[in-house]
């Protein structure tokens, strides 16, 4: 029985969101799933061989606003997208690499083939 004056509203509990993870899985993750009170993310970036590597995982609530803002980093091509709408929502995220700077070209934009 509740004591007089005690609030009957449930204490807000952190929402637990499940996300797909790849290369960012905690050691105790099972089936490439992690849990967070924050956001799921998917990121694409050039690795040190010029390959467009995709990674994914969980971001804690604290600081995730900044991390999901995708602030451009000089000399690094990468893009991140975040979501919270449902479990494993980051399976459906498709961040795209930012365009190359003009200085990377000799004679105008590159046409593939």
């Amino acid at each position: 029985k509740k004591e007089d004056g005690e609030s009957t509203a449930p204490t807000p509990r952190p929402k637990v969101l499940r996300c797909k993870c790849h290369h960012h899985c905690p050691e105790d993750s099972v089936n490439n799933i992690c849990s967070t009170d924050g956001y799921c993310f998917t990121m694409i970036e050039e690795d040190d061989s010029g390959l467009p590597v995709v990674t994914s995982g969980c971001l804690g609530l604290e600081g995730s606003d900044f991390q999901c803002r995708d602030t451009p980093i000089p000399h690094q091509r990468r893009s991140i997208e975040c979501c919270t709408e449902r479990n494993e929502c980051n399976k459906d995220l498709h961040p795209t690499l930012p365009p190359l700077k003009n200085r990377d070209f000799v004679d105008g934009p590159i046409h593939h083939r």
């Epitope: 061989s49 467009p52 590597v53 690499l97 990377d104």
Partner: antibody, heavy 116, light 107 residues
Framework: QVQLQQPGAELVKPGASVKLSCKAS????????MHWVKQRPGRGLEWIGR????????KYNEKFKSKATLTVDKPSSTACMQLSSLTSEDSAVYYC?????????WGTGTTVTVSS | DIVMTQSQKFMSTSVGDRVSVTCKAS??????VFWYQQKPGQSPKALIY???YRYSGVPDRFTGSGSGTDFTLTISNVQSEDLADYFC?????????FGDGTKLELR
């Protein structure tokens, strides 16, 4: 337009070495990574390794570490791969491929034939 | 090393058909997979990166899908110029490895 030009063919004797070239044009050579791939008929494609033309840093497939040496000549925008102690197993088409995230352009390929 | 298996060495199709080329990785590679097309006497041409991203200039009848260990390249409304070898390649871990290829031929 990005282009990677490779000599069409090289005929070499068993036990000898050969240096394959890949001349890049149409982009700033030092801002793309160069990969090398081997293709033998009916044996598929094998990744040999890659070089960062800016730093000269390399990463190799362990299988090719004692076979291939990757280098670059920045002034001529040319990547090179030296193959040593050649045997018939090294007879193949060798491709260079320039990569930068969502850009991936392959060279014309050099056919290496090892024969006495 | 990660093994990429393309179990179908040959696939028969007709112009206008829809065809799916499959590739299976021996371990989880996320979505870090390329698809290439190679015509006889030519160098490979990149079609798809990161499993589902189409390279610039690639017709939208080419679609990549899959994640983890199972990947598919679907060609809808096959054209005669699509008859070629198709290779998958994983780039999730070194050494980068390729599938043995699937040859698409006319029925």
């Amino acid at each position: 337009q990005v282009q990677l030009q490779q000599p069409g063919a090289e005929l070499v004797k068993p036990g000898a070495s050969v240096k394959l070239s890949c001349k890049a044009s149409g982009y700033t050579f030092t801002t793309y990574w160069m990969h090398w791939v081997k293709q033998r008929p009916g044996r598929g494609l094998e990744w040999i390794g890659r070089i960062d033309p800016n730093s000269g840093g390399t990463k190799y497939n362990e299988k090719f570490k004692s076979k291939a040496t990757l280098t670059v000549d920045k002034p001529s925008s040319t990547a090179c791969m030296q193959l040593s102690s050649l045997t018939s197993e090294d007879s193949a088409v060798y491709y260079c491929a320039s990569r930068r995230g969502d850009i991936d352009v392959w060279g014309t390929g050099t056919t290496v034939t090892v024969s006495s | 090393d990660i093994v990429m298996t393309q179990s179908q060495k040959f696939m028969s199709t007709s112009v206008g058909d829809r065809v799916s080329v499959t590739c299976k990785a021996s371990q989880n590679v996320g979505t870090n997979v390329f698809w290439y097309q190679q015509k006889p006497g030519q160098s490979p041409k990149a079609l798809i990166y990161a499993a589902s991203y189409r390279y610039s200039g690639v017709p939208d009848r080419f679609t990549g899908s899959g994640s983890g260990t199972d990947f598919t390249l679907t060609i809808s409304n096959v054209q005669s110029e699509d008859l070629a070898d198709y290779f998958c390649q994983q780039y999730d871990s070194y050494p980068l490895t390729f599938g043995d290829g699937t040859k698409l031929e006319l029925r």
